[in-house]
Structure formats: structure tokens, C-alpha cells
């Protein structure tokens, strides 16, 4: 004969556990139903009555099967440096991510708590490592034979143009100025191929490394705390 299916609430076998989407209620000492995502426990079970669930109110959610008496509050509205990539629904929290030109300096369980503006490399410095969603730009001084004349979070050091006759030598923050009408570019950053001994490495001044963070880099604090983790909600 097939085993009888137990309907909640029921007492588990000694040493046994409750089934998926059920929980053991310590007070009733019964296996009782959890509530589905988007709902919460309005009435806990007793020995003879199962859990009564109710929908989450506006701006609250539950993401997992649960028996929490109150839904979690959705996070506060995304701040001006963020974009809402997931709206607050009864089943999921709002997710805010950093807008272009910013990165997440302090992440939370989902989304970002604190965004910061990407560092801009000043003239004489180029991007060594580009910014990502969670890391800042890393700047480096332009090597001999390369330059950057912009304040940018994306521009790398570019090779100087190769002149037949140099009018003004290039440096870390300025390209070379040629007198001839047909300058050429070296093929690789830092590799300077000179057809004539007119323009040599000694003409490239090595800049003194200096702080490469552009002035005005700003941090924006979140409007409110992140919601607590949902308690006791695993399947």
C-alpha cells in the first residue's frame, strides 16, 4: 500500500523533518505550510489549523517561501547617482546600480549601497585599468613615447606621432609637433621608432608621478539602510 500523504499541520516522525515548503513550528510542534514569495504569515498554525498567508503590502516583499509575520520593506528609492535595475514588487526588492561614470564603492546583498564617481586620469596619465561596476579606474603615468592630453576616465596613453623633423618634442601630456607634412604613428605604445636621429628618447620628459585622482571625486551616501535579510526562509 502507498504511504498516506500527510496534510499540514501534522506531527513529524520522531527525528524526522518537514517537507519542502513546510517548517517545523516550535510552539505547535507540528509541520506547517510556509507562505509563497509575495506573501507572509498572517496567522501561524496550531495543532489543527494550518498557516494562513496574506499578500505583502505595497513597498514590501518576500522573495522566498517563508513564515515571517511581516514582509520586508523595499529599499529606499535609488539616489541620483544610481539607476533602478529592478523595481520593488511583492516578490523582490528594488535593486539600484550605479549609473555610467560611477562605480560601486560599497556593495550590499543586491545592488549598491554607495556609488562613487570614476577617477579621471589627468593629462600625463592614462588609464591602466578601466573601471568596472565594482572597481575604480587605475591611472598610470604615460611612458616615454606616449602621452595623454585629456582628463578622462577612459583614455589611455597614446604613442607620440613620429616626425621626420620635430618642431616641438612630445612629452607625457602633449603630442609631438612635426614640421613635415606627413607624420607617422609608432605602432605600439612606448615603442618609438625614429627614422632619423633628430627625435630621440631624451626629448621625452618623464613626468613626476602625482596623485591621479581628479579633483571633485565625490561619494554619495545612501538614503536609508538596506533591509534586513529575510529570516528563516530557506525552502
Amino acid at each position: 500500500l502507498p504511504a498516506q500523504v500527510a496534510f499540514t499541520p501534522y506531527a513529524p516522525e520522531p527525528g524526522g523533518t518537514c517537507r519542502l515548503r513546510e517548517y517545523y513550528d516550535q510552539t505547535a510542534q507540528m509541520c506547517c505550510s510556509k507562505c509563497p514569495p509575495g506573501q507572509h504569515a498572517k496567522v501561524f498554525c496550531t495543532k489543527t489549523s494550518d498557516t494562513v498567508c496574506d499578500s505583502c503590502e505595497d513597498s514590501t516583499y518576500t522573495q522566498l517561501w517563508n513564515w515571517v509575520p511581516e514582509c520586508l520593506s523595499c529599499g529606499s528609492r535609488c539616489s541620483s547617482d544610481q539607476v533602478e535595475t529592478q523595481a520593488c514588487t511583492r516578490e523582490q526588492n528594488r535593486i539600484c546600480t550605479c549609473r555610467p561614470g560611477w562605480y560601486c564603492a560599497l556593495s550590499k546583498q543586491e545592488g549598491c549601497r554607495l556609488c562613487a564617481q570614476l577617477r579621471k586620469c589627468r593629462p600625463g596619465f592614462g588609464v591602466a585599468r578601466p573601471g568596472t561596476e565594482t572597481s575604480d579606474v587605475v591611472c598610470k603615468p604615460c611612458a616615454p613615447g606616449t602621452f595623454s592630453n585629456t582628463t578622462s576616465s577612459t583614455d589611455i596613453c597614446r604613442p607620440h606621432q613620429i616626425c621626420h623633423v620635430v618642431a616641438i618634442p612630445g612629452n607625457a601630456s602633449m603630442d609631438a609637433v612635426c614640421t613635415s607634412t606627413s607624420p607617422t604613428r609608432s605602432m605600439a605604445p612606448g615603442a618609438v621608432h625614429l627614422p632619423q636621429p633628430v627625435s630621440t628618447r631624451s626629448q621625452h620628459t618623464q613626468p613626476t608621478p602625482a596623485p591621479s585622482t581628479a579633483p571633485g571625486t565625490s561619494f554619495l551616501l545612501p538614503v536609508g539602510p538596506s533591509p534586513p535579510a529575510e529570516g528563516s526562509t530557506g525552502d
Epitope: 516550535q26 510552539t27 505547535a28 504569515a41 498572517k42 496567522v43 501561524f44 496550531t46 495543532k47 489543527t48 489549523s49 494562513v52 509575520p69 511581516e70 529570516g231 528563516s232
Partner: antibody
Framework: QVTLKESGPGILQPSQTLSLTCSFS??????????VGWIRQPSGKGLEWLAH???????FYNPSLKSQLTISKDTSRNQVFLKLTSVVTADTATYYC???????????WGQGTTLTVSS | DVQMTQSPSSLSASLGGKVTITCKAS??????IAWYQHKPGKGPRLLIH???TLQPGIPSKFSGSGSGRDYSFSISNLEPEDIATYYC????????FGGGTKLEIT
């Protein structure tokens, strides 16, 4: 408006049985999630949960007093009753009834009734 | 049975000040803790349930926090009408009250 009111004998002799009544209004014990419980406070001491009963007649008792306690209800008359047998002087206390929510905390309380156990 | 250890048992504080009371459970109570204010001759008054949810009509000067076994309750901007005894109640596994904290204001 939710109100609860306790009534009892006031004075008992040791070994007698205490009978308490809680009369309430503003809610019904036929409503899912409703419960009524009893709590006591001996003079100068803290609160002690005794027992309670749910809308579906499920009952819970304090394990240390379970053999002496009986809780029951009359849904139509909005009343809950508690019996405590074989009282002793240590049962001298103020007895409160309180409403239980569906998520199990007491939200409304009566003002209490005082019991003195003395020979 | 779950035991609730409430401390301190009494405390004195100044008008306008802030006090914090703690309750420690003998086991994890899953945030199922409530806090009550009790004045002589009256029934206890529910202030907070589920660790930090303020009961409707209760001023925000009362607050609660905690998880697992450790919970706290605070009253800020103390006023004469806050003189009372305060109790925690765990309702995660049957029902147990803390021993109470008698608050005096100087």
C-alpha cells in the same frame, strides 16, 4: 475597541480551585487567528504566562503548571475561563487575561483581578 | 523551555536622556520578541512586537533591535510618564517573559 475584563473570587483557601472568567468585546474567538491567554503576576515579581486558547480550540499550557490548569471558552458569550486546582499561597497574584494575535503576541490586556490565597 | 534573562533589573536615568534594556534568550527565538510597559494598577501595554515593529499609536522614542538570542529595547527623550516596569516577551517557542526592568527618572 478591544476590551478585556477579568473576574474571580478574590480570596481562596489553600487546596481550593481557582475559577477565573475573562469577558471581552471588540473581537470574536470565532475569527481565524484570535486567541485569549492568561498571565499572572505575584506581588513584587514578574509576569508568568499560564495558558491560552485559540479560535480553533487548540490549547497551550505552561509546562510547569500543566497538570493543574484547564482553559476553555464560550465563543457565543465572548468569554474564556481558567481553572487552577489545588491553590497554594504562592498562587497569590494579579491574574490578567490578554488577546493573542495570529502571530502569537499579546496585544490587548485586561486590568487584572487580584487573588489572595490564605488560610 | 526558553529562559529570558532581562537586564538590568532596575535603572535610573535623567529627564531627556536615553536608556537601553537587554533580553537574552536561552535559544534562538527568531526575532519573536515583544516589549511591554507596565504601570501599577493597569494591564501591560504593548509597545513593540517582532523585535522592532512599533505598535500603532506608540511614539518613535521607543525602539527595539536584535536577532538570534540577543535583543535590546531603548527609550529616548525620557519623560516622567515613562516611569514604569518594562518586560520582554519571547513568543518563538511557547511564551516566556523576562524578569522586568523598573525604570526611575531623576
Amino acid at each position: 475597541q478591544v476590551t478585556l475584563k477579568e473576574s474571580g473570587p478574590g480570596i481562596l483557601q489553600p487546596s481550593q480551585t481557582l475559577s477565573l472568567t475573562c469577558s471581552f468585546s471588540g473581537f470574536s474567538l470565532s475569527t481565524s487567528g484570535m486567541g485569549v491567554g492568561w498571565i499572572r503576576q505575584p506581588s513584587g515579581k514578574g509576569l508568568e504566562w499560564l495558558a491560552h486558547i485559540w479560535w480553533d480550540d487548540d490549547k497551550f499550557y505552561n509546562p510547569s503548571l500543566k497538570s493543574q490548569l484547564t482553559i476553555s471558552k464560550d465563543t457565543s458569550r465572548n468569554q474564556v475561563f481558567l481553572k487552577l486546582t489545588s491553590v497554594v499561597t504562592a498562587d497569590t497574584a494579579t491574574y490578567y487575561c490578554a488577546r493573542l494575535t495570529g502571530t502569537r503576541y499579546f496585544d490587548y490586556w485586561g486590568q487584572g483581578t487580584t487573588l489572595t490565597v490564605s488560610s | 523551555d526558553v529562559q529570558m534573562t532581562q537586564s538590568p533589573s532596575s535603572l535610573s536615568a535623567s529627564l531627556g536622556g536615553k536608556v537601553t534594556i537587554t533580553c537574552k534568550a536561552s535559544q534562538d527565538i527568531n526575532k519573536f520578541i515583544a516589549w511591554y510597559q507596565h504601570k501599577p494598577g493597569k494591564g501591560p501595554r504593548l509597545l513593540i512586537h517582532y523585535t522592532s515593529t512599533l505598535q500603532p499609536g506608540i511614539p518613535s522614542k521607543f525602539s527595539g533591535s536584535g536577532s538570534g538570542r540577543d535583543y535590546s529595547f531603548s527609550i529616548s527623550n525620557l519623560e516622567p510618564e515613562d516611569i514604569a516596569t518594562y518586560y520582554c516577551l519571547q513568543y518563538g517557542n511557547l511564551w516566556t517573559f523576562g524578569g522586568g526592568t523598573k525604570l526611575e527618572i531623576t
